[in-house]
């Protein structure tokens, strides 16, 4: 397991909500990404491929999420001070081998200016 701070902007604020960006290498084909708040799993997304190369995307703990070819974004809405915490992107790489787990994260600071607009986007 590799642990570290995200070396990119992990939190993007929008109208009282936050987009948490979890990046992974372009070469990764199949993986599980979990968003952890402290030690608790908030959200997850798993991408696998079958023998016909068909993609399957699953979420056991569903959050609004968005998948690109090198990141998963998880969206949290209606921010309040209780959201302030360490958040971690827990990436399990299935393919290509070898199996590997990486953990990157950062602290989400909540400021009054980010709580002004309770709009969903």
């Amino acid at each position: 397991e590799i642990n570290g701070s995200a070396n990119y902007e992990m939190f993007i604020f929008h109208n009282g909500g936050v987009q948490i960006l979890c990046k992974y290498p372009d070469i990764v084909q199949q993986f599980k990404m979990q968003l952890l708040k402290g030690g608790q799993i908030l959200c997850d997304l798993t991408k696998t491929k079958g023998s016909g190369n068909t993609v399957s995307i699953k979420s056991l703990k569903f959050c609004h999420s968005q998948l690109s070819n090198n990141s998963v974004s998880f969206f949290l809405y209606n921010l309040d001070h209780s959201h302030a915490n360490y958040y971690f992107c827990n990436l399990s790489i299935f393919d290509p081998p070898p199996f590997k787990v990486t953990l990157t994260g950062g602290y989400l600071h909540i400021y009054e200016s980010q709580l002004c607009c309770q709009l969903k986007f």
Epitope: I27, T48, G50, S51, N53, T54, S56, D95, P96, P97
Partner: antibody
């Protein structure tokens, strides 16, 4: 240790048969699963696959519309419902685990004989 | 559907000698950095066993006398020093798209 154990049988042309495959030694619900068949003395032919929770299924053109793949993750079991069977469906049917980039575990196979 | 062909149909090689099997696909199996091509070994009376994936990566526990090479449409499985336990039929297989298909197989025997 991964184990896949199939069951099959003898059936008449036009008849139906359900194959089952009992899986153990791994988290069944984490893997796509497939059926591959092999006619006596012939090569390997892919039949069908199913994703981790059964929401995606794919079929070979030879069996589409006649065969249905399904799974019961609570019972760790894969199924193949075969209808309108023909003599040319006679083969050893293998249950296989798609291990992300290859069929990494195979059952011993079950012989399905379609004969009158 | 992608058609897989193999050559030769069969070959007999002396113990300790090199065996080479060729596989050709009717369209390229290369996507990004990966060739979606696997090799399987099937010994008499047994189910197949995964040997090589992504054209050149040996599966866990596969002896290093087995190697895979090639890209695009042309692939090769090489057994550098044939052992008695290598007598089997070898199949190439693609998972580039659906339906995945196997080659017809190459039978390897001892000369």
């Amino acid at each position: 240790e991964v184990q896949l154990v199939e069951s099959g049988g003898l059936v008449q042309p036009g008849g139906s048969l359900r194959l089952s495959c009992a899986a153990s030694g791994f988290t069944f619900s984490d893997y796509w699963m497939d059926w591959v068949r092999q006619a006596p003395g012939k090569g390997l032919v892919w039949v069908s696959n199913i994703d981790e929770d059964g929401s995606i299924t794919e079929y070979s053109p030879f069996v589409k519309g006649r065969f249905t793949i399904s799974r019961d993750n609570a019972k760790n079991t894969l199924y193949l419902q075969m209808n309108s069977l023909r003599a040319e469906d006679t083969a050893v049917y293998y249950c296989t685990r798609w291990g992300r980039f290859g069929f990494d575990s195979w059952g011993q196979g079950t012989l399905v004989t379609v004969s009158s | 559907d992608i058609v897989m062909t193999q050559s030769p149909d069969s070959l007999a090689v002396s113990l300790g000698e090199r065996a080479t099997i060729n596989c050709k696909s009717s369209q390229s199996l290369l996507s990004g950095s990966f060739n979606y091509l696997t090799w399987y070994q099937q010994k008499p009376g047994q189910p197949p066993k995964l040997l090589i994936f992504y054209a050149s990566t040996r599966h866990t526990g596969v002896p290093d006398r087995f190697s895979g090479s090639g890209s695009g449409t042309d692939f090769t499985l090489t057994i550098s020093s044939l052992q008695a336990e290598d007598v089997a039929v070898y199949y190439c297989h693609h998972h580039y798209n659906a339906p995945p298909t196997f080659g017809p197989g190459t039978k390897v025997d001892i000369k």
